[in-house]
Interface confidence: medium
């Protein structure tokens, strides 16, 4: 079951999954000036069995020189909030990630991929939060959120994290304190949440509707 919402937003914090549950999908998005190859995969899918999980499908981008590159994001009917984009955080691979049964590692980058990775999480997925550079974490509890199913609807638990404006960075579990970026980035780019706004993902499986697909009942 896919989570029907994004993980909660925490001011001045970003979230990241340590590993991705089977069923998770990642959009094959390309950077400006590029697009998916013709009839190429729209997504990568974390699949596997109890002993091994991996990403199915490969994302491929090609130049879209002949295509209007100013095309806007076209929301599908559930769009309600503005898509936020920011520079993608470098993929993180904790040592214990591979040992998690039923989970996939962060997929390696593909050529000309977009600057933001768009994941579709499934129920049971956990994401961890950290304060962005220049903010310090005040923990009231776990700095994590889990997608749960309640009364037939999905919801994310609320992470217990507050980020205050002090020059110290809270880390993801098991992550080394990062070195300052040589280029440096303005605070306006780092003090907003890196959202993983989700997009619809194509399924390659054959899909059919039952022949007796409709019934009508007068009331």
């Amino acid at each position: 079951e896919l989570c029907d919402d994004d993980p909660p937003e925490i001011p001045h914090a970003t979230f990241k999954a340590m590993a991705y549950k089977e069923g998770t999908m990642l959009n094959c998005e390309c950077k400006r000036g590029f697009r998916r190859i013709k009839s190429g995969s729209l997504y990568m899918l974390c699949t596997g069995n109890s002993s091994h999980s991996s990403w199915d499908n490969q994302c491929q981008c090609t130049s879209s020189a002949t295509r209007n590159t100013t095309k806007q994001v076209t929301p599908q009917p559930e769009e309600q909030k503005e898509r936020k984009t920011t520079e993608m955080q470098s993929p993180m691979q904790p040592v214990d990630q591979a040992s998690l049964p039923g989970h996939c590692r962060e997929p390696p980058p593909w050529e000309n991929e977009a600057t933001e990775r768009i994941y579709h999480f499934v129920v049971g997925q956990m994401v961890y939060y950290q304060c962005v550079q220049g903010y310090r974490a005040l923990h009231r509890g776990p700095a994590e959120s889990v997608c749960k199913m309640t009364h037939g609807k999905t919801r994310w638990t609320q992470p217990q994290l507050i980020c205050t404006g002090e020059m110290e960075t809270s880390q993801f579990p098991g992550e080394e304190k990062p070195q300052a970026s040589p280029e440096g980035r303005p605070e306006s780019e780092t003090s907003c949440l890196v959202t993983t706004t989700d997009f619809q993902i194509q399924t390659e499986m054959a899909a059919t509707m039952e022949t007796s697909i409709f019934t009508t009942e007068y009331q």
Partner: antibody, heavy 111, light 106 residues
Framework: PGGSLRLSCAAS????????MNWVRQAPGKGLEWVSS????????YYADSVKGRFTISRDNAKNSLYLQMNSLRAEDTAVYYC?????????????????WGQGTTVTVSS | VLTQPPSVSVAPGQTATIACGGN??????VHWYQQKPGQAPVLVVY???DRPSGIPERFSGSNSGNTATLTISRVEAGDEADYYC???????????FGGGTKLTVL
């Protein structure tokens, strides 16, 4: 006219709970008209202006079923009603059309 | 509002083009459906120019400016159908269909 009707759509062959679903209708001799959309776990619902306040879309993922409750029916609601699946799983962002359609059911509203 | 010509006629083996007009439609993703009499619609082109699996390469699409176009090359008798363009209108949160074009194979 003024009556109520409930349409049901039973899906199979794909993970129903992972897909947004739609109702689209077609009046006799006319074109396609979108009616309503519902996201995978019902958090996001949209209606065409022509049916807003009268029709209610819902789904039961445990039963792989989509529903359309139609109240205060009018003559202009007479049409073939199709249920259709959004091509891509999940719920927001890029929209890629509807790739699986039911065969349709005819609704006639007359006095 | 998406505007389509009510009808287009073409001889077998020739190329049919069906236009879908809309204000700045080139900034939206356009999808095309084929509907034969008595049948449900079938998605033939999505995201302007991509084809779902099973759709012949003869079907192609383009989108720029105020017009999206569905092109069917080497038209066959079996292509005779109604064709609809469709977009998602983010300003109204609505799915919008064009009025449809009846393709007649002479």
């Amino acid at each position: 006219p003024g009556g109520s009707l409930r349409l049901s759509c039973a899906a199979s062959g794909f993970t129903f709970s992972s897909y947004s679903m739609n109702w689209v209708r077609q009046a006799p001799g006319k074109g396609l008209e979108w009616v309503s959309s519902i996201s995978s776990s019902s958090s996001y619902i949209y209606y065409a202006d022509s049916v807003k306040g009268r029709f209610t879309i819902s789904r039961d993922n445990a039963k792989n079923s989509l529903y359309l409750q139609m109240n205060s029916l009018r003559a202009e609601d007479t049409a073939v009603y199709y249920c259709a699946r959004d091509q891509l799983a999940a719920r927001r962002g890029y929209y890629y059309g509807m790739d699986v359609w039911g065969q349709g059911t005819t609704v006639t509203v007359s006095s | 509002v998406l505007t389509q010509p009510p009808s287009v006629s073409v001889a077998p083996g020739q190329t049919a083009t069906i236009a879908c007009g809309g204000n700045n439609i080139g900034t939206k993703s356009v999808h095309w459906y084929q509907q034969k009499p008595g049948q449900a619609p079938v998605l033939v082109v999505y995201d302007d120019s991509d084809r779902p699996s099973g759709i012949p390469e003869r079907f192609s699409g383009s989108n720029s400016g105020n017009t999206a176009t569905l092109t069917i090359s080497r038209v066959e008798a079996g292509d005779e159908a109604d064709y609809y363009c469709q977009v998602w209108d983010s300003s109204s949160d609505h799915v919008v269909f064009g009025g449809g074009t009846k393709l007649t194979v002479l």
